[in-house]
């Protein structure tokens, strides 16, 4: 789960071990130099592409060993209470709309994965974050416009869904409804945040599956 310090560290890919080794080598050679992440990644990726299967073997062995470690630790890992119990989600409820950044990510994820095969989900996300930060306001606009449109649609759909789901609501007093409106909005905000976290988790899971295919 998120933030559980006892949860085993995720397994590392062969490429991740290679990058880690590159970083350590670079630190030894240039202890005081600050690393330009995108330049460094580019160089690592280029080196990885030219490496022979024999050279990659060492890192693949490290990845296998780490996978075994992860699986071993996961067998004995007990998640904190309540984590396995997800609150009921109506599959018919309108799906929360993606943010502008989320739309941007789905557009540029193939680029990152293509250029840096084997990059961990965290590093892919980090790179996408960097890319988003380097995208000028003018180029962010189409994603923001699309996200706003989808949000608008979602708000209409969710209102219709809630109205449909609560036929008694109309019979109850207007005053009582007004009082509870603020509380309800706060709850909805919390729900939205949870939804967003869950969607991110789902996307991470999907990515892990994608990585397995490659």
């Amino acid at each position: 789960g998120k933030g559980d310090p006892k949860k085993p560290r995720g397994k590392m890919s062969s490429y991740a071990f290679f990058v880690q080794t590159c970083r350590e080598e670079h630190k030894k050679k240039h202890p005081d130099a600050s690393v330009n992440f995108s330049e460094f990644s580019k160089k690592c990726s280029e080196r990885w592409k030219t490496m022979s299967a024999k050279e990659k073997g060492k890192f693949e062995d490290m990845a296998k060993a780490d996978k075994a470690r992860y699986e071993r630790e996961m067998k004995t890992y007990i998640p904190p209470k309540g984590e396995t119990k997800k609150k009921f989600k109506d599959p018919n409820a309108p799906k929360r709309p993606p943010s502008a950044f989320f739309l941007f990510c789905s557009e540029y994820r193939p680029k990152i994965k293509g250029e840096h095969p084997g990059l961990s989900i965290g590093d892919v996300a980090k790179k996408l974050g960097e890319m988003w930060n380097n995208t000028a306001a003018d180029d962010k606009q189409p994603y923001e416009k699309k996200a706003a449109k989808l949000k608008e649609k979602y708000e209409k759909d969710i209102a219709a869904y809630r109205a449909k789901g609560k036929p008694d609501a109309a019979k109850k007093g207007v005053v009582k409804a007004e009082k509870s409106k603020k509380k309800k909005e706060e709850e909805e905000d919390e729900e939205d945040e949870e939804d967003e976290e869950e969607e991110e988790d789902e996307e991470d899971e999907e990515e892990e599956e994608d990585d397995d295919d490659e």
Epitope: S38, F104, S106, E107, Y108, R109, P110, K111, I112, K113, G114, E115, E130, M131, W132, N133, N134, T135, A136, A137, D138, D139, P142
Partner: antibody, heavy 120, light 113 residues
């Protein structure tokens, strides 16, 4: 090797149409913004059009708006420029280029160009 | 649209001497949220496509000799060739990628004196 190769240029009469293609290789084509830039004989560079990685977003220079259509086929790693209602002032070498979108937005890879001549 | 204006239009410099090209944008291409200038420089030799030299106004593209350097911020930029070589004879263009449409300067022709 990262490469872009344009084709489809030629001589066409005013009012005619032409479809340019740009075949990409050596990189993840589906992850890049792609652009067309043209250069009239003896003149400077003029940005013509761009398309987002998925093909969902496009942009055009005012001089070609409504006449040119940019598109892409990610399964074929190919970029296209459909040029209709061609005018004499569209005569130029047409380059396709890769825009390093999201990383820095400059055009880091260029094709060799294809010549389009509009003349009667 | 952002207009890009280069000066001079042409420049003749002796081999080994410094060549300086200026580029001015009609509005700032500095994005305040990341403090980066969305400006690139290209080199175009006769009969060839342009080649990216500099991006972010001052970052050299990999493989570009270090005699090429870019500087400036906001609306005023400079491309400097510290010691002109015979192979540097070309037309140089600045370009903004801050907004769409992307726009180029008219070009500066660099020749040997």
């Amino acid at each position: 090797e990262v490469q872009l190769l344009e084709s489809g240029g030629g001589l066409v009469q005013p009012g005619g149409s032409l479809r340019l293609s740009c075949a990409a290789s050596g990189f993840t084509f589906s992850g890049y913004m792609m652009v067309w830039v043209r250069q009239a004989p003896g003149k400077g560079l003029e940005w013509v059009s761009r398309i987002s990685p998925s093909g969902g977003q496009t942009g055009y220079a005012d001089s070609v708006k409504g006449r040119f259509t940019i598109s892409r086929d990610n399964s074929k790693n190919t970029l296209y420029l459909q040029m209709n209602s061609l005018r004499a002032e569209d005569t130029a070498v047409y380059y396709c280029a890769r825009e390093e979108g999201g990383s820095y937005g400059a055009f880091d890879i260029w094709g060799q160009g294809t010549m389009v001549t509009v003349s009667s | 649209d952002i207009q890009m204006t280069q000066s001079p239009d042409s420049l003749a410099v002796s081999l080994g001497e410094r060549a300086t090209i200026n580029c001015k944008s009609s509005q700032s291409v500095l994005y305040s949220s990341n403090n980066k200038n969305y400006l690139a420089w290209y080199q175009q030799k006769p009969g060839q496509p342009p080649k990216l030299l500099i991006y972010w106004a001052s970052t050299r593209e990999s493989g570009v000799p270090d005699r090429f350097s870019g500087s400036g911020s906001g609306t005023d930029f400079t491309l400097t060739i510290s010691s002109l070589q015979a192979e540097d004879v070309a037309v140089y263009y600045c370009q903004q990628y801050y907004s769409t449409p992307r726009t180029f300067g008219q070009g500066t022709k660099v020749e040997i004196k």
